[in-house]
Interface confidence: medium
């Protein structure tokens, strides 16, 4: 049976970083994923690329070069994305989602010509196509409304970190998080910690079997799962203690909702 394939650095202000974590060394963590990330290098005073293993590490790690520069370089102002001339969207806005060949896990945005909106998808880190934006705002400016730039969108919405139906996953089923609304469990909006603690357990793409722990935002506990050694996401810890230390602190006590701390 034959199957058909779908078509598919800036000037520095002060030398003192804006945040103490910007002075931390790049930490790839103990996991074996290969995720292209960025860190602020205190010695060169620039944001540089490094490979992140997919779990643990430290706060001097950013998904995009832009995010790194904005966070760690004093006086860095985001250069405005030039809108396309006239009301025409560039041709690449109409390209279908292409996660790319590589096995990274990068949050990106694409223009969906069916819904006429910019949506989140997961990019593997190489190849793919040009319908691929580092920020929702950039996607909107170029593809949704190329003439009238919309007001900036706050990117760090908790829903952005939850795998949704538009995300291409590395398995055939899309792994949605369903958070039960019983009075004993925290809802997503009651969580103010690290956003990856809301991601589902992801065993990854390889063939190893390693004991790992993930934080379950519905139960407020860290549970065991088997990790295959590469890929997956940041909700992946080598010990239950590290998992709890990283994610449990985000729970907010709320008497009316009975959230367990």
């Amino acid at each position: 049976l034959s199957e058909e394939a779908d078509d598919t650095d800036s000037e520095l202000g002060s030398m003192k970083p804006l945040h103490t974590f910007c002075a931390m060394k790049a930490d790839d963590g103990p996991c074996k994923a290969m995720i292209r990330s960025y860190f602020f290098n205190m010695y060169t005073h620039q944001c540089e690329e490094f490979i992140y293993g997919g779990c643990e590490g430290n706060e001097n790690r950013f998904d995009t070069l832009e995010e790194c520069k904005k966070t760690c370089i004093p006086g860095y102002e985001k250069t405005a994305v030039k809108a396309a001339s006239g009301a025409e969207r560039p041709d690449f806005c109409f390209l279908e989602e292409d996660p790319g060949l590589c096995r990274g896990y990068m949050k990106r945005y694409l223009y969906n010509n069916q819904t006429k909106q910019c949506e989140r998808f997961v990019y593997g880190g190489c190849l793919g196509n040009r319908n691929n934006f580092e920020t929702l705002d950039e996607c909107k400016k170029i593809c949704e409304n190329p003439v009238h730039s919309p007001s900036p969108v706050n990117e760090v919405q908790m829903s952005d970190y939850v795998t949704d139906g538009n995300t291409v996953t590395d398995r055939s089923t899309v792994n949605n998080i369903v958070v039960p609304q019983s009075p004993k469990v925290p809802r997503r909006r009651d969580y103010r910690g690290r956003p990856w603690c809301l991601q589902p357990a992801d065993s990854g793409l390889c063939k190893a079997s390693e004991r790992r722990f993930y934080y379950n935002s519905a139960t407020g506990k860290c549970h065991r799962f088997n990790y295959t050694g590469c890929g997956g996401n940041n909700n992946n810890f080598t010990t239950r203690r590290r998992c709890l230390r990283s994610c449990k602190t985000g729970l907010i006590k709320n008497k009316s909702k009975g959230v367990v701390k």
């Epitope: 779908d6 690329e49 060949l101 190849l127």
Partner: antibody, heavy 121, light 108 residues
Framework: QVQLQQSGPGLVKPSQTLSLTCAIS??????????WGWIRQSPGRGLEWLGF?????????SYAVSVKSRITINPDTSKNQFSLQLNSVTPEDTAVYYC???????????WGQGTLVTVSS | DIVLTQSPATLSLSPGERATLSCRAS???????LAWYQQKPGQAPRLLIY???SRATGVPARFSGSGSGTDFTLTISSLEPEDFATYYC?????????FGQGTKVEIK
């Protein structure tokens, strides 16, 4: 050890369709994290990447602009192989055609033996 | 498209000498996605280096790769008779993947 075995005619007439097949052993055409592609080499052009297919949650392909309107690369999961079709060929398409496995992080680590395709009447 | 320019076009050296091959990209390429290949007449290319500096399985330690951004280098520390061949760089960072035009290393 991944091995790729190419098959297909070495002579194609102008305006006809060039068809080549690449049989895979030691891996699966549906494997996650690898792409299966075609590259050609002619004295005038050097190595030219034509395109590839790969599977994540569904099949994806990517083609070079120079051949995009004429090329199709398809997987055949039942035979664990993939094929190249290049329509409306001209003598400019005369080249040695290679199939290759592109690893997601590791380059083209396995190649077919190459097939010299001559476009001539 | 990212254009990769290799230099020199031909390198004439003797066995035992050090070979330094250059690959320059028209725009920045992630070092994770740059590879080097060796090709001998009548044969398919053979992967030598991936991720700009990682040796592929079975590749001798005399081959090393380095570089970042737009400038990448393949070094053969001491040429053996079997190393005389044509070498290509390839980027697989962005679509379309592209190759350099090649550097031929010939016996002086």
């Amino acid at each position: 050890q991944v091995q790729l075995q190419q098959s297909g005619p070495g002579l194609v007439k102008p305006s006809q369709t060039l068809s080549l097949t690449c049989a895979i052993s030691g891996d699966s055409v549906s494997s996650n994290g690898a792409a299966w592609g075609w590259i050609r080499q002619s004295p005038g052009r050097g190595l030219e990447w034509l395109g590839f297919i790969y599977r994540r949650s569904k099949w994806y392909n990517s083609y070079a602009v120079s051949v995009k309107s004429r090329i199709t690369i398809n997987p055949d999961t039942s035979k664990n192989q993939f094929s190249l079709q290049l329509n409306s060929v001209t003598p400019e398409d005369t080249a040695v055609y290679y199939c290759a496995r592109q690893d997601g992080m590791g380059g083209m680590d396995s190649w077919g033996q190459g097939t010299l395709v001559t476009v001539s009447s | 498209d990212i254009v990769l320019t290799q230099s020199p076009a031909t390198l004439s050296l003797s066995p035992g000498e050090r070979a330094t091959l250059s690959c320059r990209a028209s725009q920045s390429v992630s070092s994770f996605y740059l590879a080097w290949y060796q090709q001998k007449p009548g044969q398919a290319p053979r992967l030598l280096i991936y991720g700009s500096s990682s040796r592929a399985t079975g590749v001798p330690a005399r081959f090393s790769g380095s570089g970042s951004g737009t400038d990448f280098t393949l070094t053969i520390s001491s040429l053996e008779p079997e190393d005389f061949a044509t070498y290509y760089c390839q980027q697989y960072d962005s679509t379309p993947s592209t190759f350099g035009q090649g550097t031929k290393v010939e016996i002086k």
